[in-house]
Interface confidence: medium
């Protein structure tokens, strides 16, 4: 069974079959005797009850109000009323683009990564029994596919697959031919698989400093766009007015990843800044990586092996 029309605001294209289905349909069957009414209001007209005599284009079936087809003057608010249940929709009927096989405002955009599975299936469950044939067009050129009832594309995406795909269902109703168009704008993008973010350089860095001077600790990482890089130091970040985090700088790599660098600036170095850990962390959905800096007085350099120093 086709699901009910739950969206309160709907945009449709003139000249196509269209329907509204209220969302208490199962309930409506249980209370067959209850009065069920459909109303329309637009502009000056307030709550005009709809019935097949209102227009030859309107049909009422159980839970559904059908338009054969919907036209520009059908724009307005629609109400379904049954006992103490009311449902309202705002319908906006837009002009068909007569110079194209689809109307730009009624396009669904999809992004597909190259080499990933790409599928388009032309289906319309509500009108399924009335559909004579269905055609699939790419950029308004008909694709020759085997199945003319439910044409389908299933493949691994290539960049050439990018374009506008239109499913056009042809159906008969009361001796007239109608068509319903559903268009997808398919964009093929580079593989966006994530890397494991990595901090550059050794995990532990001893930095030789002089009291009263300034030092800049540079933390660099290769990471994904969504990953974050931050500094942690002391018991409470921000408690030392001499410590400043500089702006984070990111450079985009040709592969679409980011080279990030965040500097911690320590001004007027004091005893309290020595021999404590200044940690830089990169965090991603896949976990974290941390590197540490320790400030050491230049006079104490002799106590530490040379290979652990950064200058």
């Amino acid at each position: 069974a086709e699901s009910c029309t739950s969206r309160p605001h709907i945009t449709v294209v003139e000249g196509e079959p269209f329907y509204l289905k209220h969302c208490s349909c199962s309930l409506a069957h249980e209370i067959e005797t209850t009065t069920k009414s459909w109303y329309k209001s637009s502009g000056s007209q307030e709550h005009v009850e709809l019935n097949p005599r209102s227009s030859s284009r309107i049909a009422l079936h159980d839970c559904v109000l059908e338009f054969w087809p919907v036209e520009l003057n059908d724009t307005g608010s629609y109400f379904f009323q049954m006992k103490n249940y009311t449902q309202k929709w705002k319908l906006n009927v837009i002009r068909r683009n007569k110079h194209s096989c689809f109307t730009e405002r009624q396009v669904t955009s999809k992004i597909v990564e190259v080499k990933k599975f790409f599928q388009i299936t032309c289906e319309n469950s509500y009108y399924q029994t009335l559909v004579n044939s269905t055609s699939l067009y790419k950029n308004c050129k008909k694709l020759l596919l085997e199945n003319n009832k439910n044409p389908t594309i299933k493949k691994n995406a290539e960049f050439e697959d990018q374009g506008y795909y239109s499913c056009v269902h042809f159906l008969h109703h009361n001796g007239k031919l109608f068509n319903i168009t559903k268009t997808f704008n398919i964009t093929i993008v580079e593989d966006r698989s994530n890397i494991v973010p990595v901090l550059l350089g050794p995990k532990l860095n001893h930095v030789a400093v002089e009291l009263g001077k300034n030092v800049r600790l540079n933390c660099s990482a290769l990471l994904n766009e969504e990953d974050v890089i931050y500094w942690m130091f002391g018991e409470e970040n921000g408690s030392d007015p001499n410590i400043h985090e500089e702006k984070e700088m990111r450079i985009m790599t040709p592969e679409g990843k980011w080279h990030a660098s965040k500097v911690l600036r320590i001004e007027n170095i004091g005893e309290s800044n020595l021999n404590v850990l200044y940690n830089c962390t990169v965090a991603s959905t896949g976990g974290t990586d941390t590197k540490s800096f320790i400030l050491v007085r230049k006079a104490d350099m002799a106590d530490i092996p040379g290979h652990v120093f950064t200058r």
């Epitope: 992004i111 702006k247 984070e248």
Partner: nanobody, 126 residues
Framework: DVQLQESGGGLVQAGGSLRLSCAAS????????MGWFRQAPGKDREFVAG????????YYRDSVKGRFTISRDNAKNTVWLQMNDLKPEDTAVYYC???????????????????WGQGTQVTVSS
């Protein structure tokens, strides 16, 4: 109505400088990450630089690193792109754009930006 209005483009000799401005109105500017993109004739629109809503993180494409600087002033609802040492390959229409995410990163993908300016032409002659 949301408006992003770029200015500051023009014709400049190689090695010269330009400062592009983007004045925003009709949106809570400090809630949006901002980006600059450019589009040269016959080419796709490409990311140039971006800045988070607070200005705490900045982003550049590799080819403009060290030459271009992005900055913003939330009180003035403005974002700037200072372009130094311009090269002929920097010739393009430059667009200012606002990204939907308040917290998080400005994005290099133009599809993630919800508001766009009309663009300003930058021409660098050799």
């Amino acid at each position: 109505d949301v408006q992003l209005q770029e200015s500051g483009g023009g014709l400049v000799q190689a090695g010269g400088s330009l400062r592009l401005s983007c004045a925003a109105s009709g949106l809570p500017f400090s809630s949006y990450a901002m980006g600059w993109f450019r589009q040269a004739p016959g080419k796709d629109r490409e990311f140039v630089a971006g800045i988070t809503w607070s200005g705490s993180s900045i982003y550049y494409r590799d080819s403009v690193k060290g030459r271009f600087t992005i900055s913003r002033d939330n009180a003035k609802n403005t974002v700037w792109l200072q372009m130094n040492d311009l090269k002929p390959e920097d010739t393009a229409v430059y667009y200012c754009a606002a990204a939907r995410r308040r917290v998080g990163l400005p994005l290099a993908d133009p599809r993630e930006y919800v508001y766009w300016g009309q663009g300003t032409q930058v021409t660098v002659s050799s």
